[in-house]
């Protein structure tokens, strides 16, 4: 039963990844972990709070180039850590230097990785909290949106959109569009160097 | 670089209509949610509405549904707002914003809802 | 709809100290993703808001380093770990969990 949902997720998430490297970083190999369905999602490292303590915060070490698209990449960690210890901020990828951080691609594969564990969670009753957000991932995937304005017509209210999916892809086209920009940066800053 | 630039905002009667626009450049237009966001004189801010990529799906704060009609011209990278049967209470600077997380406003458009 | 409150509504500060500004949701933000889709803005006077935090604690892009957001579920704060005469401004807070995205009525940052 779980084979034909995960096939066609992959298609999905194939036809909606936005660069060929992603695409084939995906196509490597299977999802970790995806025959069990973890028991709670996978958080991102990147949004994971920092501890609760009274003590100041370090302030993050930064590339100096760092804008908000990359700071999306270079701040992706390992989705295989337990959510139960999560890295603050001050001892993420970035505050290592030269640690092995995860390339463009591979935070990209990631990204989707995440949503599509949450494609694979058991199925929950029509309304609770994981099931309105499982059906987000499928509304952030391509699929249909459960209360557009061209349905809003009907006298019952319509549940409240779950943004946050919307909003996980939106980060992902804003690193993106960051790092074609930093791309074309780069190559003109080449050009100027060929040309003298 | 990113700019947004909203136009239209006048001074209104009550039961009146307005059409605001917002300008993009800079940006990938058709890759973003776009947002109103208003703010009464010497008040906090408030939503008001936003629009999917591709103008499929819109969503409003109670206050102005039915009233308010949000839209989207991706060819021409242009963001609207129809403002129907106008109320003082709509009185505002109207800003627009790019995405979800509103990481670029603009400069804002005053309108006047008065007798 | 899900509410903000933020505290204190009015902060003092004198340059170079900390300031921290709270805000409260009246549901829990943590997304079954572990996102907290919070963000913090910050509108000098006369200008138009600009994004300071993104989901509740990445700094946006060109945001000195002395800003911090933190937080998890219903709780969040914002540290500005030495207060600049230029910080000077109304603070907000949005949620972006769902429709209608929602605002905290603001903390305005003076200098004393």
């Known amino acids: 039963m779980r084979l034909p949902l995960l096939v066609s997720a992959g298609v999905l998430l194939v036809a909606l990844l936005p660069c060929p490297p992603c695409r084939a970083l995906l196509s490597r190999g299977p999802v970790p972990g995806a025959r069990q369905a973890p028991q709670h999602p996978q958080p991102l490292d990147f949004f994971q709070p920092p501890p609760q303590s009274e003590q100041p915060q370090q302030p993050q070490a930064r590339p100096v180039l760092l804008r908000m698209g990359e700071e999306y990449f270079l701040r992706l960690g390992n989705l295989n850590k337990s959510p139960a210890a999560p890295l603050s901020p001050a001892s993420s990828l970035l505050a290592g230097g030269s640690g092995s951080r995860p390339s463009p691609e591979q935070a990209t594969a990631n990204f989707f990785r995440v949503l599509l564990q949450q494609l694979l969670l058991p199925r929950r009753s029509l309304d609770s909290p994981a099931a309105l957000a499982e059906r987000g991932a499928r509304n952030a995937l391509g699929g249909h949106q459960e209360a557009p304005e061209r349905e809003r017509r009907s006298e019952e209210p319509p549940i409240s959109l779950d943004l946050t999916f919307h909003l996980l892809r939106e980060v992902l086209e804003m690193a993106r569009a960051e790092q074609l920009a930093q791309q074309a940066h780069s190559n003109r800053k080449l050009m100027e160097i060929i040309g003298k | 670089e990113v700019q947004l630039v909203e136009s239209g905002g006048v001074l209104v009667q009550p039961g009146g209509s307005l059409r605001l626009s917002c300008a993009a450049s800079?940006?990938?237009?058709?890759?973003?949610?776009m947002t109103w966001v208003r703010q009464a004189p010497g008040k906090g801010l408030e939503w008001v509405a936003n629009i999917k990529q591709e103008g499929s799906e819109k969503y409003y704060v109670d206050s102005v549904k039915g009233r308010f009609t949000i839209s989207r011209d991706n060819a021409k990278n242009s963001l609207f707002l129809q403002m129907n049967s106008l109320r003082a209470e709509d009185t505002a600077v109207y800003y627009c914003?790019?995405?979800?997380?509103?990481?670029?406003w603009g400069q804002g458009t005053l309108v006047t809802v008065s007798s | 709809d899900i509410v903000m409150t933020q505290s204190p509504l009015s902060l003092p500060v004198t340059p170079g100290e900390p300031a921290s500004i709270s805000c409260r949701s009246s549901?829990?933000?943590?997304?079954?993703?572990?996102?907290?889709?919070l963000e913090w803005y910050l509108q000098k006077p006369g200008q138009s808001p600009q994004l300071l935090i993104y989901l509740g604690s990445n700094r946006a892009s060109g945001v000195p380093d002395r800003f911090s957001g933190s937080g998890s579920g219903t709780d969040f704060t914002l540290k500005i770990s030495r207060v600049e005469a230029e910080d000077v401004g109304i603070y907000y807070c949005?949620?972006?969990?769902?429709?209608?995205?929602?605002f905290g009525q603001g903390t305005r940052l003076e200098i004393k």
């Open positions: 800079g940006f990938t237009f058709s890759s973003y949610w």
């Open positions: 949005m949620q972006t969990l769902q429709t209608p995205i929602t």
């Open positions: 914003a790019r995405t979800l997380i509103f990481d670029y």
């Open positions: 549901q829990s933000l943590l997304h079954s993703t572990g996102y907290n889709p």
